[in-house]
């Protein structure tokens, strides 16, 4: 008989290499039976995982599995790091393996002006 526990299917040591400035969706595959659990994303900061409060998320439902998606619109250099999704189910907290985003800043140092230069461009 198939287990009716909630399961989060992020593979151990999963990683994504992505570009800053473009959108990206980070998926947390969630398997559940009856009631969809409450799922959240957090970002690892040392040993603690800081809950991502003001970020856009959505659900994508497929036949045998659902995905809780964290949206990056767009990816920022600051998004580099490791993330984890967690599900609350019948008073139990289930945590996924962490998944790591490697963000490449597509703009080279020569192309990226300083903040002062950036500001002065508006008044050219």
């Amino acid at each position: 008989k198939e287990s009716c526990d909630v399961q989060l299917y992020i593979k151990r040591q999963s990683r994504h290499s992505i570009l800053a400035g473009d959108p990206f969706e980070l998926e947390c595959p969630v398997k559940y039976c009856a009631n969809r659990p409450h799922v959240t994303w957090c970002k690892l900061n040392g040993t603690t995982c800081v809950k991502l409060e003001d970020r856009q998320t959505s659900w994508k439902e497929e036949k045998n599995i659902s995905f809780f998606i964290l949206h990056f619109e767009p990816v920022l250099p600051n998004d580099n790091g490791s993330y984890r999704c967690s599900a609350n189910f019948q008073s139990n907290l289930i945590e996924s393996h962490s998944t790591t985003l490697y963000v490449t800043d597509v703009k080279s140092a020569s192309e990226r002006p300083s903040k002062d230069e950036m500001a002065s461009r508006f008044w050219a």
């Epitope: 570009l19 800053a20 400035g21 473009d22 959108p23 409060e53 003001d54 970020r55 856009q56 949206h71 619109e73 767009p74 920022l76 250099p77 600051n78 597509v106 703009k107 192309e111 903040k115 950036m118 461009r121 508006f122």
Partner: antibody, heavy 120, light 106 residues
Amino acid sequence: QVQLKESGPGLVAPSQSLSITCTVSGFSLTTYGVHWVRQSPGKGLEWLGVMWPGGRTSYNPAPMSRLSISKDNSKSQVFLKMNSLQTDDTAMYYCVRGDYEYDYYAMDYWGQGTSVTVSS
Amino acid sequence: QIVLSQSPAILSASPGEKVTMTCRASSSVSYMHWYQQKPGSSPKPWIYATSNLASGVPARFSGSGSGTSYSLTISRMEAEDAATYYCHQWSSNPYTFGGGTKLEIK
């Protein structure tokens, strides 16, 4: 020097479609996103959608079904197409460059806008 | 969608006066941008990410806030500050603007 310039038809008949071209200079469409924002007296500023550097698009869900954004990187042009125009689509349409810093994203350079009036 | 409510809609201030306008979001946002627009011109970036002044913006301007409440302050009003100021959130699609605060000089 970064510049964006919109060119549109000016006048569109109700139920017809609108096509606006945004020609950019001073930056590459493969590095920066370009957004479409409109401003009407009734609705104020309204973000319509964006063409991301890699070629994906994101749209405002409200007018999304009528909107299409595309681009030609080699010509440094971004295109907005909107179908089934009504009188409340009358507005100034701006194309705007998007840029990111370390921890935030914003629209920095705005075109001068192109005025679109929907009327028979 | 996140609704941004700006108040007051119209604000009249004398030269030298301190001016504060607010922007309230219907849900929490990570940060707020502000744009200045004068009649016949495109909006100009004015304050980025809550408190970073865009280049060329006088130091008498400042921005603050968090969560659902943000504000733009002018320490001493000057005639050139008369314009409409819009707040703008980039936390959740659709990315919305406030209805604007029109700042007039007395």
